[in-house]
């Protein structure tokens, strides 16, 4: 999960494995102030998971979320 510092969530590690696409309802990018660029996926249970924006599955999920 992202770590919040002064209301700015940042990620310090990325999940490696793909999350089930059907479990993800939305996403957001962490702030440019964070040391690591990251995508945060929000699951249907409102859990937040940090992911590496350079990973193929992450880019694929972002594209499909944008289209839906």
């Amino acid at each position: 999960s992202p770590y919040s510092s002064d209301t700015t969530p940042c990620c310090f590690a990325y999940i490696a494995r793909p999350l089930p696409r059907a479990h993800i309802k939305e996403y957001f990018y962490t702030s440019g102030k964070c040391s690591n660029p990251a995508v945060v996926f929000v699951t249907r249970k409102n859990r937040q998971v940090c992911a590496n924006p350079e990973k193929k599955w992450v880019r694929e999920y972002i594209n499909s979320l944008e289209m839906s």
Epitope: Y14, I15, A16, L19, P20, H23, R44, K45, R47, W57
Partner: antibody, heavy 119, light 108 residues
Framework: QVQLVQSGAEVKKPGASVKVSCKVS????????MHWVRQAPGKGLEWMGG????????IYAQKFQGRVTMTEDTSTDTAYMELSSLRSEDTAVYYC????????????WGQGTTVTVSS | SYVLTQPPSVSVAPGQTARITCGGN??????VHWYQQKPGQAPVLVVY???DRPSGIPERFSGSNSGNTATLTISRVEAGDEADYYC???????????FGGGTKLTVL
Amino acid sequence: QVQLVQSGAEVKKPGASVKVSCKVSGYTLTEFAMHWVRQAPGKGLEWMGGFVPEDGETIYAQKFQGRVTMTEDTSTDTAYMELSSLRSEDTAVYYCATDPLYTPGLEPWGQGTTVTVSS
Amino acid sequence: SYVLTQPPSVSVAPGQTARITCGGNNIESKSVHWYQQKPGQAPVLVVYDDSDRPSGIPERFSGSNSGNTATLTISRVEAGDEADYYCQVWDSNTDHWVFGGGTKLTVL
């Protein structure tokens, strides 16, 4: 170092159920997604399903939906896979395999459990 | 669901290079993992995310992924490399892990 130790071989009659266990040592079960993969004699690997810790849910391969149940006992760091309504085509080696949080791919795997379905 | 196609067998002489392919529709858009399975043993991950190697896996094992084909390359093949090799991808349309049918590598 993570190690997975599975229960011993089973012989079952058609229509029965089998429950295979997989004990994790070296780490706690909650640090991993546990998956189950089977391999029929002389055939390839077939993914059956696995646990998604980030959502606390288990996903199953469509082929096994309704016939397989995967559970975990975190107090003993043991995962279980139960397959019901067994038929001869279910004769296979069943593997548990971990999907570590920060490393892609399934690694390591259990040693495998042979399940034979025969009347 | 997503289908991965592997040749059933590949033969190579010791010291030569073995190439094992894994075909899939636009597979370059997916991360491919490769497993080695020796007779009577559980599979072992040898390459992940197309071309990365887990610690302990020799540099002789490498991977690539382009277009509709991913390739596992084993250079300077040794007798101990004789095994079945499986590719694997995540299919986000079904939320399933998918394995290729496997390739038996024979060292002549």
